[in-house]
């Protein structure tokens, strides 16, 4: 991928998913009525024509927003601090790496539009999540619904990254 989103980035993404899974505090079976349609922009991660700049931008904005969401007083009150610290550290490492990659991609002349457009869409999506948490008064079930939603969207974003890596491998071997 140019800067190659190396294997360890995929590994860090999977570690983030594992941490999010371990953070569960209450049984999700208690929270069915709190489900909400956050309208994750699936089209952003489902396309077959994946551009390097687009993928990196989506991943960067996703991780940035997750970091912000779980880096608040409300979040500290809701989750196990040890796991939360591990989550912050892992996200910070991934963000640093992605920032280096993004600078390189922009330097290679890929469109700035491919970078700014996903960011705006994802900010709206995460704003919806923040509004929901506030509406629900940051209840345990609201945080549980959000944790599951973040896991789903991060899983889809990580899949997009894997698809791009395998596409690059195919191009490299042909």
């Amino acid at each position: 991928l140019g800067c190659d989103l190396p294997q360890n980035h995929g590994l860090l993404s999977r570690n983030t998913l594992v941490l999010l899974h371990q953070m569960r505090r209450i049984s999700p079976f208690l929270c069915l009525k709190d489900r909400r349609d956050f309208r994750f922009p699936q089209e952003m991660v489902k396309g077959s024509q994946l551009q390097k700049a687009h993928v990196m931008s989506v991943l960067h904005e996703m991780l940035q927003q997750i970091f912000s969401l779980f880096h608040t007083e409300r979040s500290s009150a809701a989750w196990n601090m040890t796991l939360l610290d591990q989550l912050h550290t892992g996200l910070h490492q991934q963000l640093q790496h992605l920032e280096t990659c993004l600078l390189q991609v922009v330097g290679e002349g890929e469109s700035a539009g491919a970078i700014s457009s996903p960011a705006l869409t994802l900010r709206r999506y995460f704003q919806g999540i923040r509004v929901y948490l506030k509406e629900k008064k940051y209840s345990d079930c609201a945080w549980e619904v959000v944790r599951m939603e973040i896991m789903k969207s991060l899983f889809l974003s990580t899949n997009m990254q894997e698809r791009l890596r395998s596409k690059d491998r195919d191009l490299g071997s042909s």
């Epitope: 899974h21 569960r24 049984s27 999700p28 079976f29 208690l30 929270c31 069915l32 009525k33 709190d34 489900r35 909400r36 349609d37 956050f38 549980e144 619904v145 599951m148 939603e149 789903k152 899983f155």
Partner: antibody
Framework: EVQLVQSGAEVKKPGESLKISCKGS????????IGWVRQMPGKGLEWMGI????????AYSPSFQGQVTISADKSISTAYLQWSSLKASDTAMYYC??????????????WGQGTLVTVSS | DIQMTQSPSSLSASVGDRVTITCRAS??????LNWYQQKPGKAPKLLIY???SLQSGVPSRFSGSGSGTDFTLTISSLQPEDFATYYC?????????FGQGTKVEIK
Amino acid sequence: EVQLVQSGAEVKKPGESLKISCKGSGYSFTSYWIGWVRQMPGKGLEWMGIIDPSDSDTAYSPSFQGQVTISADKSISTAYLQWSSLKASDTAMYYCARHPGLNWAPDFDYWGQGTLVTVSS
Amino acid sequence: DIQMTQSPSSLSASVGDRVTITCRASQSIAGFLNWYQQKPGKAPKLLIYYASSLQSGVPSRFSGSGSGTDFTLTISSLQPEDFATYYCQQSYSIPITFGQGTKVEIK
């Protein structure tokens, strides 16, 4: 293609034990819960319980609590429903179905083909 | 537990008829209601989820409405393949519960 494939029909005697299975494929098995539903001959659908295969957390209908055990083995994408001591009244068709958990998606959108359990002396 | 009551328990109709089945919950379930169709010897099939969303691949003659405690499944023009039993189901809370079913028969 998403599929839930259940184990075959069983004929058992009262007092015997039984474990039936439901194997998921074509999707991320740990991203969905698996529910079990009973249908006695000529009757309606009864929800028995549900499992989150990612950590094997379960919830049961009060009518089935203590009567059956739901489990899962995520390494082989399979959920199970078991009885330690069958009764004649357990004779029924048993279905598994996937549920999106807390994600906003259709409930029980894919079902297994059903396992017919007959308990008779 | 939330009780789900369907009416009627059975009905006779002709091809082309408009058919309406109702489902009432014993307490408010917001919009967490699903409708299933089951034919003899087959597994149930999801038709409508979240009260009014049509499941992928289901013909548009099926529609759902309602929220709170009262819900409706409508088949705008009954087709030969629609003769089956229909169930409502709430997923507002555990234990999940089904209605007793409505059998749609040929008149």
